[in-house]
Interface confidence: medium
């Protein structure tokens, strides 16, 4: 707690400017009006305040807004955001995507901090769902964001938002997460033609059921082995040799290299040897 002291004569700050870097922390507390600070927050980032001075500025804002900062202040926090605790952030009501972007920019290049996680949580809850623009923004800053959500949280993602998802955003998703996302992707891309549909749905196929894989096998999609290896084992097992051959197209030869790995290993064991022999790959059931 900074001790309350009178502002020295002639030091009352008429605006937030460079001269304040020469103020001791008790002078900042005594001579800077909190309401002035709130209206000129955008200037703070241009001034080389020490971390100690930023503590004082934060303290002033906390006193002015004990129930939480208004969005007009939050949007211009800049690197003062790094001083906020998750408890501070839980008091905020952030509705503007521009505000979210401005604060994520401050933390750019770093791992997601507890502050950022809290901010995102508050923002998404405030919006009621993870809409496309929000998802676009979050995955741009944190490619692994989507896969950090629980299946329950993912269930609030509307199909329209799936258009914002890039293949790399799903790299760390587990099967339970893909189980939730796949039906949404299927719905989102349903009006696309065969080859375009496959390009879009490919990275979500780890959540696809057998019947959808059977349908894809009829469309000359030429699925690569990397995608095939990420499919659910229980979805692959019922596929016939002919269906897998059609599904993989020219990539079917890659099965040999993967014959000891799931789901290929389990699938091979389920097939008749005569059927496997038709592939000419020397696969042994």
């Amino acid at each position: 707690e900074v001790e309350k002291t009178a502002c020295p004569s002639g030091k009352k700050a008429p605006e937030i400017d460079e001269s304040l870097i020469f103020y001791k922390k008790w002078e900042l507390e005594a001579c800077v009006d909190a309401a002035l600070l709130a209206t000129q927050m955008d200037r703070v980032n241009a001034i080389p305040f020490t971390y100690e001075q930023l503590d004082v500025l934060k303290h002033k804002l906390d006193e002015l807004y004990p129930q939480g900062y208004p969005e007009s202040v939050i949007q211009h926090l800049g690197y003062l955001f790094l001083k906020m605790s998750p408890e501070d952030i839980r008091k905020w009501n952030v509705t503007s995507l521009e505000t979210l972007k401005a604060l994520l920019e401050v933390n750019k290049g770093h791992e997601m901090s507890p502050q950022v996680a809290t901010l995102i949580d508050r923002f998404v809850k405030g919006r009621g769902q993870l809409d496309k623009d929000t998802l676009d923004t979050l995955t741009a800053f944190y490619p692994g964001y989507l896969c950090s959500l629980s299946p329950e949280e993912l269930s609030s993602v509307p199909p329209s938002s799936i258009w914002a998802v890039r293949p790399q955003d799903l790299d760390t998703c587990d099967p339970r997460q893909l189980d939730v996302l796949y039906p949404k992707a299927r719905l989102a891309f349903q009006n696309m033609n065969g080859s375009e549909y496959f390009v879009k749905i490919q990275s979500f196929l780890g959540g696809a059921p057998t019947e959808d894989l059977k349908a894809l096998s009829q469309q000359n999609v030429s699925m690569d082995l990397a995608t095939f290896m990420k499919l659910r084992t229980d979805a692959v097992l019922p596929l016939t040799v002919a269906e897998v051959q059609k599904l993989l197209g020219p990539h079917v030869e890659g099965l040999k290299a993967e014959e000891r790995h799931r789901p290929v290993r389990d699938w091979i064991l389920r097939q008749r040897q005569d059927d496997l022999d038709t592939l000419g790959l020397g696969l042994q059931g």
Partner: antibody, heavy 118, light 107 residues
């Protein structure tokens, strides 16, 4: 990647001045602070001051006020430190460092040796 | 000014050891402590800031801890390339001040 390239070694006379430069590359120069640090032979590190290249705002260690002047040229992404009225006590290696991404002293220049000798 | 004291100027260690370097501030610095590594002929390198946050690219065998006035840098599994001089620094209030340094040497 972030790099800070400092000017070469200087041999200067007592009572004169010297200007050390620190050219930044690999990031937006005006976004982050540049710190200056002194190290005398066999001694520890001493903070001289900091400049915000975007605004020109500075803050000095009281000990170096009147001795060091920090400036920055946005057009060339270069920070400067001028040392005046040099004495043998000013013979040292001077480092610039960038508070890149708000990590304190995140990246350092290679250092500039200043030798004050008659 | 805040004084940062590294009580050990030298520490003997072996490859594979767990090493802890300590630093004491003359007043509470609210976890605003950084650690730097310096090898002969090189500039200091930032390892840790805000007492425990690892800087980009720093191996996870380096960890920082502490609060108030007492701070520690720990190397969980000493490697030959970690032989260097280590400085603590407070980045809480100006003038920012550094500890005198702790040099790690091979036993």
């Amino acid at each position: 990647q972030v790099q800070l390239q400092q000017s070469g070694a200087e041999l200067v006379r007592p009572g004169t001045s010297v200007k050390v430069s620190c050219k930044a590359s690999g990031y937006a120069f005006t976004n982050y602070l540049i710190e200056w640090v002194k190290q005398r032979p066999g001694q520890g590190l001493e903070w001289i001051g900091v400049i915000n290249p975007g605004s020109g705002g500075t803050k000095y260690n009281e000990k170096f006020k009147g001795k060091a002047t920090l400036t920055a040229d946005k057009s060339s992404s270069t920070a400067y430190m001028q040392l005046s009225s040099l004495t043998s006590e000013d013979s040292a290696v001077y480092f610039c460092a960038s508070d890149y991404d708000y990590d304190p002293f995140a990246y350092w220049g290679q250092g500039t040796l200043v030798t004050v000798s008659a | 000014d805040i004084v940062m004291t590294q009580s050990h100027k030298f520490m003997s260690t072996s490859v594979g050891d767990r090493v802890s370097i300590t630093c004491k501030a003359s007043q509470d610095v609210s976890t605003a402590v950084a650690w730097y590594q310096r090898k002969p002929g090189q500039s200091p390198k930032l390892l840790i800031y805000w007492a425990s946050t690892r800087h980009t690219g720093v191996p996870d065998r380096f960890t920082g801890s502490g609060s108030g006035t007492d701070y520690t840098l720990t190397i969980s599994y000493m490697q030959a390339e970690d032989l260097a001089l280590y400085y603590c620094q407070q980045h809480y209030s100006t003038p920012y001040t550094f500890g005198g340094g702790t040099k790690l040497e091979i036993k």
